[in-house]
Interface confidence: low
Amino acid sequence: SEIALPRGSDITVHIKLVSPALPVKFCYIVVSRQHVTELTIRPGERKSFTFSCNNPEKHYVLKIEKNIDCMSGPCPFGEVRLQPSKSELPILNRTYIWDVRAHKSIGLELQFATPRLRQIGPGESCADGVTHSISGHIDATEVRIGTFCSNGTVSRIKMQEGVKMALHLPWFHPRNISGFSIANRSSIKRLCIIESVFEGEGSATLMSANYPGGFPEDELMTWQFVVPAHLRASVSFLNFNVSNCERKEERVEYYIPGSTTNPEVFRLEDQQPGNMAGNFNLSLQGCDQDAQSPGILRLQFQVLVQRPQNESNITYMVDLSQERTMSLTIEPRPVKHGRRFVPGCFVCLDSRTCSTNVTLTAGSKHKISFLCDDLARLWMNVEKTLSCLDHRYYYGKSFNLQVPKDILQLPVQLHDFSWKLLVPKDRLGLMLVPGQKLQQHTRERPCNTSFGYQVASTTPGQDLYFGSFCPGGSIEKIQVKQNSSVTLRTYAPGFQQEVSKQVLTVSLIPYFKEEGIFTVTPDSKNKVYLRSPNWDRGLPALSSVSWNISVPSNQVACLTFFRERSGLACQSGRAFMIIQEQQTRAEEIFSLEEEVLPKPSFHHHSFWVNISNCSPMNGKQLDLLFWVTLTPRTVDLT
């Protein structure tokens, strides 16, 4: 190889070891019969050399530096050429560095041909190995603007007082043009301006200068976004830090064409604007930092540009002004995306403040709209607390647990609506009465409705889950003795129609000793499966549950237990089951420890099943599953 650099070219070529610290085995640069490990060719020099090995690209790299002096004469503006060209250089990884020095009053603009640039963060690399590293100057200090790959949105970078551009090309890359040009501009009176052009839907991630290090003190940096008028842009901050300011305030400013409040000023902690039509600018302004404890200002953010959906022009009013204890959260449902570009899915408050999750609180009216390609990506969770702690006032009162209509009219699936029901301890209990009788979800007879209710008692320290229930069964009432949560959970899209037919009434009733009482009226067509609360984890120690099972006068009920034995072992106390005929009060008592569970039994009249637990030994909890079937009476035995 021979490299010749004309005088005045202001180009210097260095051939250096990839890792100078590592010993070189059998690979040297051979120049004038000497074996060396470093070679520099300066302007006006010509050097011939070879390598003593067949794979020099593993051992050596090329660094080509060109100084462009705009201080002492006119600047060579226009397209920047790769000199020396690829064909003049040995086949090594090469980095071209252009160092442009200019007066403070002169603006310099780097213009990138398509494909434009995409900024990458620390630890990221470019797929094709081609990277652009761009730095600026503040007096004698170098400031890193960023590292970029191809195929992005960054079209121009404006700076003043000088710019350093490094283009790294892997040895195998065929590129023979720089891909950028330099133009002069008037002073920009800030560190830099980065222009980002979107031609269609897409996203760009951008970072403040020196990221992840600190943004220079009291500096200003601007991003100009060019967005087609028919698309919408949303800004979200992925990562930021604020420094300790002595004077002024760190902030971001938006210039949004058509806005009457330009510039719109936000703190970095604020929710950033979304749903912006057309072009806009974003500026980051630093402050005078505390000399003792400066901290660092840094920002990494994403701009997402996408088509407005039909919904983005529709505003929904959610009126929680009459509510005291309700909160509604709209959030992404947990799904994995296979697509490369995933459009954002935002909920917008007052059409401008958009974010992926929004919680609407009680006491206000909320105007919301959506900026989302597919609203099925979102769901809603609602919590409402009903506090009935004054037992004299609330005794005998009833409430309907119904989902408010303006929540059902939202175009987002309701996932959970949870009512937290608080009652005074040992004073009042709760009775849940469904409009349509309920079925308990079991493995043997799972629910397949579009929604169901999950009922649990929520006393701290006690984990008691009564079960999951859905319309279309035999359970007429559920009585719960203490604070409870009832969660309506939806399973299928058509639930709105079904849920509007279903009312669940909660009444405050006198306190009772059992954890729960289920009132069951079996229907003659189906087996009724019932299982004890806290299934799989065991009924809590020393608690009891009852089932009040009605038997129509022309039917006989058969009560069958799923297992032969309960599997329970008591540490202390006794565990037993009472089956009591309601008409005659005749009762049978079974120990749930030693004895075999009762064989199938026939009941001609309504009866109670009550189970009372002991303090079980670990691993020997009480879980019972039984079923009731009805058959017509053949002979009246009364």
Partner: antibody, heavy 120, light 112 residues
């Protein structure tokens, strides 16, 4: 990627309450999982303290009796530990962890832990 | 509460050796739903524990196949077929079948 980060005071005085926060990113605490607190005493002994499940059930280690409470704030995707009336025996590294209650049944995701010293 | 007894307390091995750690329970760890929630975790110095094996013998995703778990009654064993340097640390067994969930005392795997 699911990430859990514990935060809270590193020093608590005896008889005061210890309050820790676990911030979960990459997964909604209302979607699934039991969200646990586990501590490791000097000498490496590990103790499970309790959890709040995605659907708000709680379960606690009986040895902590009425001192412990695990709560959550779904809007911030955080869950919390409160331990009342601490003594020097509560000096430990406290981990928050996500347990796949129904799948693996194990504690799949752990925070890095935060050291709490109880001392006057 | 269920006490899990791990042995040995310390296990010096040479790289490439097989290692075997035992975890014993006096009571059954079979949950009423039929599952046995016995897990193994590895804690490296300065790190949080990481799940290796769950439900006695199922490897967690990303765990090399040199790790295996087995059981005989209420005795559980973790085996490492060929110890590598990255396997060093403290191994804990953990039962999640019965509240309170409990950990074993730990076994330190170290180089001979």
């Amino acid at each position: 990627e699911v990430k859990l980060v514990e935060s809270g005071p590193g020093l608590v005085k005896p008889s005061q309450s210890l309050s820790l926060t676990c911030t979960v990113t990459g997964y909604s605490i209302t979607s699934d999982y039991a969200w646990n607190w586990i501590r490791q005493f000097p000498g490496n002994k590990l103790e499970w303290m309790g959890y709040i499940s995605y659907n708000t059930y709680t379960s606690y280690n009986p040895s902590l009796k009425s001192r412990i409470s695990v709560t959550r704030d779904t809007s911030k995707n955080q869950f919390f530990l409160q331990l009342k009336s601490v003594t020097i025996e509560d000096t430990a590294t406290y981990f928050c962890a996500g347990g796949d209650y129904y799948g693996t049944g194990a504690v799949d995701y752990w925070g890095q832990g935060t050291t709490v010293t109880v001392s006057s | 509460e269920i006490v899990l007894t791990q042995s040995p307390l310390s296990l010096p091995v040479s790289l490439g050796d097989q290692a075997s750690i035992s975890c014993r329970s006096r009571q059954t760890l079979v949950h009423t739903n039929g599952n046995t929630y016995l897990d193994w975790y590895l804690q490296k110095p300065g790190q949080s524990p990481k799940l290796l094996i769950y439900k006695v013998s199922i490897r967690f995703s990303g765990v090399p196949d040199r790790f295996s778990g087995s059981r005989s009654g209420t005795d559980f064993t973790l085996k490492i077929s060929r110890v590598e340097a990255e396997d060093l640390g403290i191994y804990y067994c953990f039962q999640g079948s019965h509240v309170p969930w409990t950990f074993g005392g730990g076994t330190k795997l170290e180089i001979k």
